[in-house]
């Protein structure tokens, strides 16, 4: 004969556990139903009555099967440096991510708590490592034979143009100025191929490394705390 299916609430076998989407209620000492995502426990079970669930109110959610008496509050509205990539629904929290030109300096369980503006490399410095969603730009001084004349979070050091006759030598923050009408570019950053001994490495001044963070880099604090983790909600 097939085993009888137990309907909640029921007492588990000694040493046994409750089934998926059920929980053991310590007070009733019964296996009782959890509530589905988007709902919460309005009435806990007793020995003879199962859990009564109710929908989450506006701006609250539950993401997992649960028996929490109150839904979690959705996070506060995304701040001006963020974009809402997931709206607050009864089943999921709002997710805010950093807008272009910013990165997440302090992440939370989902989304970002604190965004910061990407560092801009000043003239004489180029991007060594580009910014990502969670890391800042890393700047480096332009090597001999390369330059950057912009304040940018994306521009790398570019090779100087190769002149037949140099009018003004290039440096870390300025390209070379040629007198001839047909300058050429070296093929690789830092590799300077000179057809004539007119323009040599000694003409490239090595800049003194200096702080490469552009002035005005700003941090924006979140409007409110992140919601607590949902308690006791695993399947």
């Amino acid at each position: 004969l097939p085993a009888q299916v137990a309907f909640t609430p029921y007492a588990p076998e000694p040493g046994g556990t409750c089934r998926l989407r059920e929980y053991y209620d310590q007070t009733a000492q019964m296996c009782c139903s959890k509530c589905p995502p988007g709902q919460h426990a309005k009435v806990f079970c007793t020995k003879t009555s199962d859990t009564v669930c109710d929908s989450c109110e506006d701006s609250t959610y539950t993401q997992l099967w649960n028996w929490v008496p109150e839904c979690l509050s959705c996070g506060s509205r995304c701040s001006s440096d963020q974009v809402e990539t997931q709206a607050c629904t009864r089943e999921q929290n709002r997710i805010c991510t950093c807008r272009p030109g910013w990165y997440c300096a302090l992440s939370k369980q989902e989304g970002c708590r604190l965004c910061a503006q990407l560092r801009k490399c000043r003239p004489g410095f180029g991007v060594a490592r580009p910014g990502t969603e969670t890391s800042d730009v890393v700047c480096k001084p332009c090597a001999p034979g390369t330059f950057s004349n912009t304040t940018s979070s994306t521009d790398i050091c570019r090779p100087h143009q190769i002149c037949h006759v140099v009018a003004i030598p290039g440096n870390a923050s300025m390209d070379a100025v040629c007198t001839s009408t047909s300058p050429t570019r070296s093929m690789a950053p830092g590799a300077v191929h000179l057809p004539q001994p007119v323009s040599t490495r000694s003409q490239h001044t090595q800049p003194t490394p200096a702080p490469s963070t552009a002035p005005g880099t700003s941090f924006l604090l979140p409007v409110g705390p992140s919601p607590p983790a949902e308690g006791s909600t695993g399947d």
């Epitope: 310590q26 007070t27 309005k42 009435v43 806990f44 007793t46 003879t48 009564v52 008496p69 308690g231």
Partner: antibody, heavy 119, light 106 residues
């Protein structure tokens, strides 16, 4: 408006049985999630949960007093009753009834009734 | 049975000040803790349930926090009408009250 009111004998002799009544209004014990419980406070001491009963007649008792306690209800008359047998002087206390929510905390309380156990 | 250890048992504080009371459970109570204010001759008054949810009509000067076994309750901007005894109640596994904290204001 939710109100609860306790009534009892006031004075008992040791070994007698205490009978308490809680009369309430503003809610019904036929409503899912409703419960009524009893709590006591001996003079100068803290609160002690005794027992309670749910809308579906499920009952819970304090394990240390379970053999002496009986809780029951009359849904139509909005009343809950508690019996405590074989009282002793240590049962001298103020007895409160309180409403239980569906998520199990007491939200409304009566003002209490005082019991003195003395020979 | 779950035991609730409430401390301190009494405390004195100044008008306008802030006090914090703690309750420690003998086991994890899953945030199922409530806090009550009790004045002589009256029934206890529910202030907070589920660790930090303020009961409707209760001023925000009362607050609660905690998880697992450790919970706290605070009253800020103390006023004469806050003189009372305060109790925690765990309702995660049957029902147990803390021993109470008698608050005096100087």
């Amino acid at each position: 408006q939710v109100t609860l009111k306790e009534s009892g004998p006031g004075i008992l002799q040791p070994s007698q049985t205490l009978s308490l009544t809680c009369s309430f209004s503003g809610f019904s014990l036929s409503t899912s999630g409703m419960g009524v419980g009893w709590i006591r406070q001996p003079s100068g001491k803290g609160l002690e949960w005794l027992a309670h009963i749910w809308w579906d007649d499920d009952k819970f008792y304090n394990p240390s007093l379970k053999s002496q306690l009986t809780i029951s209800k009359d849904t139509s008359r909005n009343q809950v009753f508690l019996k405590l047998t074989s009282v002793v002087t240590a049962d001298t206390a103020t007895y409160y009834c309180a409403r239980l929510t569906g998520t199990r905390y007491f939200d409304y309380w009566g003002q209490g009734t005082t019991l003195t156990v003395s020979s | 049975d779950v035991q609730m250890t409430q401390s301190p048992s009494s405390l004195s504080a100044s008008l306008g000040g802030k006090v914090t009371i703690t309750c420690k459970a003998s086991q994890d109570i899953n945030k199922f803790i409530a806090w009550y204010q009790h004045k002589p001759g009256k029934g206890p008054r529910l202030l907070i349930h589920y660790t930090s949810t303020l009961q409707p009509g209760i001023p925000s000067k009362f607050s609660g926090s905690g998880s697992g076994r450790d919970y706290s309750f605070s009253i800020s901007n103390l006023e004469p009408e806050d003189i009372a005894t305060y109790y925690c109640l765990q309702y995660g596994n049957l029902w147990t009250f803390g021993g109470g904290t008698k608050l005096e204001i100087t």
